[in-house]
């Protein structure tokens, strides 16, 4: 018996508007009905929770109103979008999946997605 496998892309480049999207896919050992997904960021030996959502299979992911994350679920796949990113937010973003109900509980952690964020150059002043 091993830890639940979680797959996510190795690298993602955020858009010029500071938006990054990636898929987090998990190999469910059972028929979970309640799943918790947490996005963690590891950078400079610090680990912070970016966002988290608990959802019922077949329903939408619901993050807190002030969350920088949005997402949708389809089967054992979660499509995550993180907004408002700046260059200083570059780091390794890890998908943590917990099968909460019914028992038994399972935990899986992905190998992380390195998200690169490049702040856009300011527009030059126009003479017009």
């Amino acid at each position: 018996c091993k830890a639940m496998h979680v797959a996510q892309p190795a690298v993602v480049l955020a858009s010029s508007r500071g938006i990054a999207s990636f898929v987090c896919e998990y190999a469910s050992p059972g028929k979970a009905t309640e799943v918790r997904v947490t996005v963690l960021r590891q950078a400079d030996s610090q680990v912070t929770e970016v966002c988290a959502a608990t959802y019922m299979m077949g329903n939408e992911l619901t993050f807190l109103d002030d969350s920088i994350c949005t997402g949708t679920s389809s089967g054992n796949q979660v499509n995550l979008t993180i907004q408002g990113l700046r260059a200083m937010d570059t780091g390794l973003y890890i998908c943590k999946v917990e099968l909460m109900y019914p028992p038994p509980y399972y935990l899986g952690i992905g190998n992380g997605t390195q998200i690169y964020v490049i702040d856009p150059e300011p527009c030059p002043d126009s003479d017009f």
Partner: nanobody, 127 residues
Framework: EVQLVESGGGLVQPGGSLRLSCAAS????????IGWFRQAPGKERETVSC??????SYADSVKGRFTISRDNSKNTVYLQMNSLRAEDTAVYYC??????????????????????WTQGTQVTVSS
């Protein structure tokens, strides 16, 4: 699936020793980091120590006093606590995390990476 059960808490005088055990069933410990955490009343849960196949890590507050070890034949992780102080009084929890290549000495004990939390065992250091 992994199931963890901890034991060994109790009341001890300052300067005394205790050994906590965390026994795993349902899986070998090999692919996991096992961590010890503690929570004092009114405070956040904090890292004490953790161990994987090749590395150990400790919170600064317990370095030199606590020792973590694992016995793979018994599927058990131990936390030997010596020179106990009043400030070590807390509920102690054992938890597991899948061992990942990106874990560093500084991050492998981070509580965000853990699950399979035990119910906790009370450790009270008092005269």
């Amino acid at each position: 699936e992994v199931q963890l059960v901890e034991s060994g808490g109790g009341l001890v005088q300052p300067g005394g020793s205790l050994r906590l055990s965390c026994a795993a069933s349902g899986s070998t410990l090999d692919p996991f980091v096992i961590g010890w955490f503690r929570q004092a009343p009114g405070k956040e849960r904090e890292t004490v120590s953790c161990i994987n196949r090749s590395r150990t890590s400790y919170a600064d507050s317990v370095k030199g006093r606590f020792t973590i070890s694992r016995d793979n034949s018994k599927n058990t992780v131990y936390l030997q606590m010596n020179s106990l102080r009043a400030e070590d009084t807390a509920v102690y929890y054992c938890a597991a995390s899948p061992d990942k290549p990106f874990y560093t000495d500084q991050t492998m004990c981070n509580k965000h990476y853990y699950g399979y939390w035990t119910q906790g065992t009370q450790v009270t250091v008092s005269s």
